[in-house]
Interface confidence: low
């Protein structure tokens, strides 16, 4: 009888854990949807305002090939850096190639000197894999130097010509990126 009761109790506990997990997933999903909604709104506003002036990038953004970059004049923690890029219809910088890395680091040298800038790279808490915001993995030459011994969430940032890692709750400048508008000729 006692064994039966404890089995039922364990089953109930397992059910509770599953429900908590589902609730947590739903909360994450809801937050993600809210951010995506804001991104879409910002993107629409951005597209409309850009349609009026035909330059490929907004004021204060730098152009390189098909991308526009915004180097922040304020600093914030990684999560809020991403939110602020979303608000501008962009995302945190995703470095696709060494050429792009060279352009970014060269531009930063001219603009600001040797500061820390968040990019859209974070470490998956479970697997320890580095991931860009779109879920893709960085190319081997663009993995952050192992610098952070933090037990907290770890995110990637650019400093001078290096890609480094740090606790996501530290405050840094950040770089946003979005597609440049094609001029309609």
């Amino acid at each position: 009888k006692l064994l039966q009761v404890s089995t039922i109790a364990m089953q109930q506990q397992e059910k509770l854990i599953q429900q908590e997990r589902a609730l947590l997933n739903f909360t994450e999903w809801k937050r993600s949807c809210a951010l995506q909604m804001k991104y879409c709104q910002a993107f629409m506003q951005n597209s409309l305002s850009s349609a009026h002036n035909s330059s490929p990038c907004p004021n204060n953004w730098i152009q390189n090939r098909e991308s526009c970059y915004y180097v922040s004049e304020i600093w914030s923690i990684w999560h809020t850096s991403q939110e602020n890029c979303l608000k501008e219809g962009s995302t945190l910088l995703q470095i696709e190639s060494k050429e792009e890395m060279d352009f970014i680091t060269g531009s930063l040298r001219k603009i600001k000197g040797s500061y820390d800038y968040w990019v859209g790279l974070s470490q998956d808490g479970h697997s320890g894999r580095w991931l860009w915001q779109d879920g893709s993995s960085p190319s081997p030459g663009l993995l952050p130097a192992e610098r952070s011994q933090s037990a907290n969430q770890v995110c990637g940032y650019v400093k001078s010509n290096s890609l480094l890692s740090s606790n996501c709750s530290t405050w840094k400048y950040f770089i946003c990126e979005k597609y440049a508008l094609r001029s309609s000729v």
């Epitope: 004049e73 809020t80 939110e83 946003c176």
Partner: nanobody, 117 residues
Framework: DVQLVESGGGLVQAGGSLRLSCATS????????TGWYRQAPGREREFVAQ????????YYADSVKGRFTISRDNARNTVYLQMNNLKPGDTAIYYC??????????WGQGTQVTVSS
Amino acid sequence: DVQLVESGGGLVQAGGSLRLSCATSGLTFSSYYTGWYRQAPGREREFVAQISWSDDSTYYADSVKGRFTISRDNARNTVYLQMNNLKPGDTAIYYCDARKVGGPDYWGQGTQVTVSS
């Protein structure tokens, strides 16, 4: 003219509580994200807590997690920091700030918090 005015600091015994307020004026409060920093004598100013503009997500320094709570009231243009279970190590001047993309960041004058053991 943008102004951030902190209040609520004071002297409290270890284990006690304080609630800091930061009243802002001259900015569109709801589009700024706001945070608290602190600076102890002879140390760098350090991040304490922040609340985002978009969905009231909150972020905390590890040293205050579980003890401090940041909140904001957009109707009153005010951000709060509820500090519980205070420790002597929390003694510092606490500053409130407001910032947004492409704009400057604004700071208050600070309010002194002293925790005695």
